[in-house]
Amino acid sequence: EKWEETELDQLFSGPLPGRLPVNHRPFSAPHSSRDQLPPPQTGRSHPAHTAAPQVTSTASKLLPPVAFNHTIGHIVLSEHKNVKFNCSINIPNTYQETAGISWWKDGKELLGAHHSITQFYPDEEGVSIIALFSIASVQRSDNGSYFCKMKVNNREIVSDPIYVEVQGLPYFIKQPESVNVTRNTAFNLTCQAVGPPEPVNIFWVQNSSRVNEKPERSPSVLTVPGLTETAVFSCEAHNDKGLTVSKGVHINIKVIPSPPTEVHILNSTAHSILVSWVPGFDGYSPLQNCSIQVKEADRLSNGSVMVFNTSASPHLYEIQQLQALANYSIAVSCRNEIGWSAVSPWILASTTEGAPSVAPLNITVFLNESNNILDIRWTKPPIKRQDGELVGYRISHVWESAGTYKELSEEVSQNGSWAQIPVQIHNATCTVRIAAITKGGIGPFSEPVNIIIPEHSKVDYAPSSTPAPGNTDS
């Protein structure tokens, strides 16, 4: 591994702090905050150039002061180089309790995977300790203040700082971002890069050509007066170490959306159609709303077009208030801030048959006492084609007497216009209503016809219905 050739190397190859015998061999230990020093030797004087300890205690005032020796302070090196530095301290043998040296960076203890070694050089006066720290291939994250700490006689001693400044190519903290813009409308792009080293200068590039002849200091805001077509912008960040280029971003011109596609009918009822579609390309501007256009397909003339507006999402709309059993042509168009898309291809859709719109007419009710049945008759209602094919009738009959209430209904087929139902309760009132049924559903009920059912044979007959137009009772 090649190490950066700086004055730092003297910290390893140069003379050690304090007086050590020439033939003295050090012993080493990997860094741990729990390293124990060897037994202290005889006393000696303290070296002159030391960093003042950060903490003092009453007990320690009885002993000569001990502090880390001065070392390199501000290390400047390039990214990916190797660096090594150290802390050293001389502990006289008068100090009985000492713990190992720990390394700290920006206020946090460095534990684990850092390459540090502590070397001990004992002699007759005490022990010299050197804590070596090395970083291979430094990165920006290695920038910061490094300190050594150790406890001597329960007093924490902190070294002077070693500030590691890793210099490299500019590093982007804000790159231009893709934006969609209105044609010929001004917009801004921002680019910010940092060192060290500083300053960082910015050049803007549009479609591979430089925009500004003179660089701007980071951060830089480029105001583009307007574009008529899509362009690609990037920024170059320069410092003394070289150049970094940002990502290229596409600036798109907003246009009207493409027409929706895949218009489908999901469900039809007699009076509504549920339609879905796939939005077309949004034209680089969010779709705001959509318009469903509906026209009757059967009309020979250009019938009026019904327009239903809805939000752009979900891509679904229920068209309501349509005629039953009718054919319609349907298309969809959507808009963004620029304008409306062309309409989608028209598709055909049909509503199903509806329920009858008119109740049966001329309802009469008779009591057949001998058979104990009600005889009910009516006239078939005038059913339109879109109401569908008549399939039968529903007869509702409600029986009421003192303390009793019974609500019943029967369905009868469309053959004929009469029905018989058994008497349920005597000495009661029976209310009869009839509705026509088609495949489209059940129509409205007729006006009620009441009949009083006597205890034995007295009958009060009360027909109550509107005669069909043009018909007379016989």
């Epitope: 501000h74 920006d106 206020g107 500030y163």
Partner: antibody
Framework: QSLEESGGRLVTPGTPLTLTCTVS????????LGWVRQAPGKGLEYIGI??????TYYATWAKGRFTISKTSSTTVDLKITGPTTEDTATYFC??????????????????WGPGTLVTISL | DIVMTQTPASVEAAVGGTVTIKCQAS??????LAWYQQKPGQPPKVLIY???HLASGVPSRFKGSGSGTQFTLTISDLECADAATYYC?????????????FGGGTEVVVR
């Protein structure tokens, strides 16, 4: 990146005065900002600094006489609590050289404002 | 506090010549030292940091050296544009405080 001082004016002794440093393109949560003054025809005099974390440090002579505070994401104030004629000077704000989310560090000054003149006179 | 003593207070030299400015710290500041250039009516501009590292855009005619308590700024091949006042600054710090201080300044006159 730029800095600009404002608030410099003529005041009488004892009248508190607040100067404001407004930054552009500088993230005050990443950089320290310091104040330095220069009396007419004299040298530069360090007053104090506010770190990226908001910790303040003052020169010994300036403690109690000046207060530095971050008032927004783009402004830092220097309050001269009880000015005397000796405080007549051009006051500069300057950005610390290194970005870092720590309370202390090597604070030499990389970018300076043009300065604002404060005159303390009767 | 750390006190920075700068000498000389003023120095004169001819175009093409060399000037040397010295700065002494009252205690060891390792290499936490910066040099600034200031011209009349302008704010200072950093020339050198970490005692010997040239700031961006500064010509290599400016050279810083020293460590501990003794520092030197040397300007060689003097140009008229170098006429200015030069200041040293300690930016030493500890784990609990910072010790910023400027020297008194040296005026460089280029004739």
């Amino acid at each position: 990146q730029s800095l600009e001082e404002s608030g410099g004016r003529l005041v009488t002794p004892g009248t508190p005065l607040t100067l404001t440093c407004t930054v552009s393109g500088i993230d005050l949560s990443s950089y320290a900002l310091g104040w330095v003054r220069q009396a007419p025809g004299k040298g530069l005099e360090y007053i104090g600094i506010i770190s990226s974390t908001g910790t303040t440090y003052y020169a010994t002579w300036a403690k109690g006489r000046f207060t530095i505070s971050k008032t927004s994401s783009t402004t830092v104030d220097l309050k001269i609590t009880g000015p005397t004629t000796e405080d007549t000077a051009t006051y500069f704000c300057a950005r610390g050289a290194y970005a870092g989310y720590v309370a202390f560090g090597p604070y030499y000054f990389h970018i300076w404002g043009p300065g604002t003149l404060v005159t303390i006179s009767l | 506090d750390i006190v920075m003593t700068q000498t000389p207070a003023s120095v004169e030299a001819a175009v093409g010549g060399t000037v040397t400015i010295k700065c002494q710290a009252s205690q060891s500041i390792s290499n936490f030292l910066a040099w600034y250039q200031q011209k009349p009516g302008q704010p200072p501009k950093v020339l050198i940091y970490a005692a010997s590292h040239l700031a961006s855009g500064v010509p290599s005619r400016f050279k810083g050296s020293g460590s501990g308590t003794q520092f030197t700024l040397t300007i060689s091949d003097l140009e008229c544009a170098d006429a200015a006042t030069y200041y040293c600054q300690s930016y030493f710090y500890s784990s609990t405080s910072i010790y910023n201080a400027f020297g008194g300044g040296t005026e460089v006159v280029v004739r």
